[in-house]
């Protein structure tokens, strides 16, 4: 008899094996029927091992060995043994952000009979492999809760019968895709033509971002570094050397493994400073002996629209004004508190326009003519005095919460024209005839 | 599997214009920043242009600046480049790529641009 | 613009040999340096992005090294695949610039 019948190695197309027979016989005959599905095979050998080739991959064979000897045959023993499946190969993959459906070939003739066991893992981290294996005659399989934009390797193993596996696997590196940014926001800096975009990095791996800013024909493109999502940080950056006052489109895009998510996009535009100050200064002509007409020019709106205008009348020195000068009124300068007041008050918005950067408004006004605006009263002008003018314009106008109507100058956006030419005023007309 | 196909390269005088194209497959075309990179025989690798997703800003190397194009639609899933004004110093293979983060990631098999009287 | 010196300009290495390519910019570039393969007749092979890690598919005997101006690509166990031209390129800042190239040959 033959027992203990060893598979001692198997692969697609070769069996080694061995076995035992009570004693030591040496002129043992041993006949081997193999047989398959595909037929059936004679073979004998003096050895108490045999190499079977020309097999078919993924195939169970029979083999059953008969000891002879002197024309006498012992009692047969029989095992069975699967051939390996051949390799798979052209793994193909295709991602989303936390998933992979991945598809292969096998071109064994018993492929419909082999079921595949894939074995996923996360580049550096091979502890936590993820085992998948697919339904016999199924070539593909969709893997999921990946993390996204990273790197993964997988190995699939064609299996047949009871867990007898390809010698090698097919191997297949890919990505995830990344995840886009679900957000962020802007922020204006204020007094500086910048923006702080600020965001929480978005779930997975990421090599960086693209950054895109743009308005009409300008546009700006740069590198963002990675950040990473674990601890729910904010992250931030500063836009630079933008204008004042202007919108701009703005997109972030999520780059890891080389691929690049969808973008996300904002409009944002940027805050004001104190408008530019204008070269000229404002023109002021006589009327009468107590008033005066003050022509100027709108200011610049390159740092934000203007909204305001105040005009500033001195008799002092026409040194270059402050803000300090705005908290004046014309009683305090009759009081003699001040050589210099704000005598008239202008709202922009009040006009009912929209002023484009381009377009240059012209005002005109009468000083003295005893109107109030606001916190301000325009007061008669005294005859024989020697006044300038001056304009203050305001792209943020605050106002005093205490003293009701009267500017703060440190809380509010303004610049200053020089001082005019001084003009001086007639005798009032009646201290003549009087 | 992402693939990058271009064509429209040929023999073209001096002074007159040509228009590539570099048709993307396997990837989300419109997500993508996409260049391209010549390279003159035997010589090394020049980038040409380059263009965003989000806006479709686009970016010239100076010697090309006025002369060529880059443009996209991401319907077609289709890079162009419109070459005006050619010389001789613009015959190349040319090449598109993605270009994610600065880097060429991934690359067509180039047309030939060959510009002689 | 950034200048990309790559030295050595030609190269020979025995199989088995472990090879060294040496990329220098003009400027401060980050991190933002990618090493490309090419061989005769083909299309430029992404290798390493971003200084160091290693493209998809790449064997793990590439890798590279480096941030700011200087930066190395370092091949271990030369093999006859890796023959062919090797690139750097700084993607930090337009006109983005490549190095001359390096020629490898297997001796």
């Known amino acids: 008899a033959v027992f203990d019948i060893h598979v001692v190695y198997v692969t697609t197309t070769e069996m080694w094996l061995d076995w035992k027979s009570p004693d030591g016989a040496s002129e043992y005959v041993y006949h081997l029927v193999i047989e398959s599905k595909h037929g059936s095979n004679h073979t004998s050998t003096y050895d108490k091992a045999i190499t079977l080739q020309g097999l078919i991959p993924g195939t169970l064979y029979n083999i059953t060995i008969s000891p002879e000897v002197d024309h006498v045959w012992g009692d047969p023993n029989s095992t069975a043994q699967y051939t390996r499946p051949s390799n798979v190969s052209n793994i193909d993959v295709s991602t989303n952000t936390t998933a992979a459906t991945l598809s292969w070939q096998n071109f064994d003739d018993a492929s419909p009979t082999y079921s595949y066991c894939l074995l996923i893992e996360k580049a550096g981290n091979s502890s936590n492999a993820t085992q998948v294996v697919t339904d016999i005659g199924i070539t593909d399989a969709t893997v999921t809760e990946l993390i996204p934009g990273s790197s993964y390797t997988v190995e699939i193993f064609a299996q047949v019968g009871d867990g007898i596996k390809s010698l090698e696997p097919g191997r297949k590196s890919f990505c995830t895709d990344p995840a886009s940014m679900a957000s962020f926001d802007c922020e204006v800096v204020p007094k500086e033509p910048a923006l702080v975009l600020k965001w929480t990095c978005p779930p997975g791996a990421n090599a960086g971002f693209e950054l895109e800013v743009s308005s009409g024909a300008w546009n700006n493109a740069t590198h963002l570094e990675s950040c990473s999502s674990e601890n729910g940080t904010e992250y931030r950056t500063e836009v630079t050397y933008l204008n004042f006052s202007t919108s701009y489109n703005i997109s972030i895009t999520t780059v890891s493994c080389g691929k690049m998510a969808a973008p996300t996009r904002n409009t944002c535009t940027t805050g004001i400073t104190d408008p530019p100050p204008p070269d000229g200064s404002p023109n002021i002509t006589s009327v009468s002996h107590n008033s005066v007409k003050v022509k100027f020019s709108g200011f610049e709106a390159s740092h934000g629209p203007i909204k305001a205008y105040a005009v500033i009348l001195t008799t002092g020195e026409a040194g270059h004004p402050s803000a300090d000068v705005l908290k004046y009124t014309y009683e305090d300068f009759k009081k003699g508190a001040s050589d210099t007041y704000v005598t008239y008050l202008i709202r922009t918005e009040e006009k009912g326009r929209s002023q484009s950067l381009s377009e240059v408004l012209k005002y005109e006004i009468d000083v003295g003519n005893e109107s109030t605006t606001l916190g301000y009263y325009n007061g008669k002008l005294e005859p024989l005095g020697s006044y300038r003018a001056c304009v203050a314009g305001f792209t943020n106008i605050t106002f005093h919460p205490q003293n009701k109507g009267l500017i703060d100058g440190a809380e509010s956006y303004v610049s200053f024209s020089r001082y005019s030419d001084a003009v001086s005023l007639p005798q009032d007309p009646g201290v003549i005839c009087g | 599997e992402v693939k990058l196909v271009e064509s429209g390269g040929g023999l073209v005088q001096p002074g007159r214009s040509l228009k590539l194209s570099c048709a993307a497959s396997?990837?989300?075309?419109?997500?993508?920043?996409m260049a391209w990179v010549r390279q003159a025989p035997t010589k090394g690798l020049e980038w040409v242009a380059y263009i965003t997703n989000g806006f479709g800003s686009t970016y010239y190397r100076d010697s090309v600046k006025g002369r060529f194009t880059i443009s996209r639609d991401n319907a077609k899933s289709t890079l162009y480049l419109q070459m005006d004004s050619l010389r001789s110093e613009d015959a190349a293979t040319y090449y598109c790529?993605?270009?994610?983060?600065?880097?060429?990631?991934?690359w067509g098999q180039g047309t030939l641009v060959t510009v002689s009287s | 613009d950034i200048q990309m010196t790559q030295t050595p300009h030609s190269l020979s290495a025995s199989l088995g040999e472990t090879v060294s390519i040496e990329c220098l910019a003009s400027?401060?570039?980050?991190?933002?340096l990618a090493w490309y393969q090419q061989k005769p007749g083909k299309s430029p092979q992404l290798l390493i992005s971003y200084a160091n890690p290693l493209h998809d598919g790449v064997p793990s005997r590439f890798s590279g090294s480096g941030s700011g101006t200087q930066f190395s690509l370092k091949i271990r166990n030369m093999q006859p695949e890796d023959e062919g031209v090797y690139y750097c390129q700084q993607g930090y800042k337009f006109p983005y610039t490549f190095g001359a190239g390096t020629k490898l040959e297997l001796t």
């Open positions: 396997g990837f989300t075309f419109s997500n993508y920043y």
């Open positions: 790529s993605t270009v994610p983060l600065g880097a060429f990631v991934s």
């Open positions: 400027e401060g570039i980050s991190n933002y």
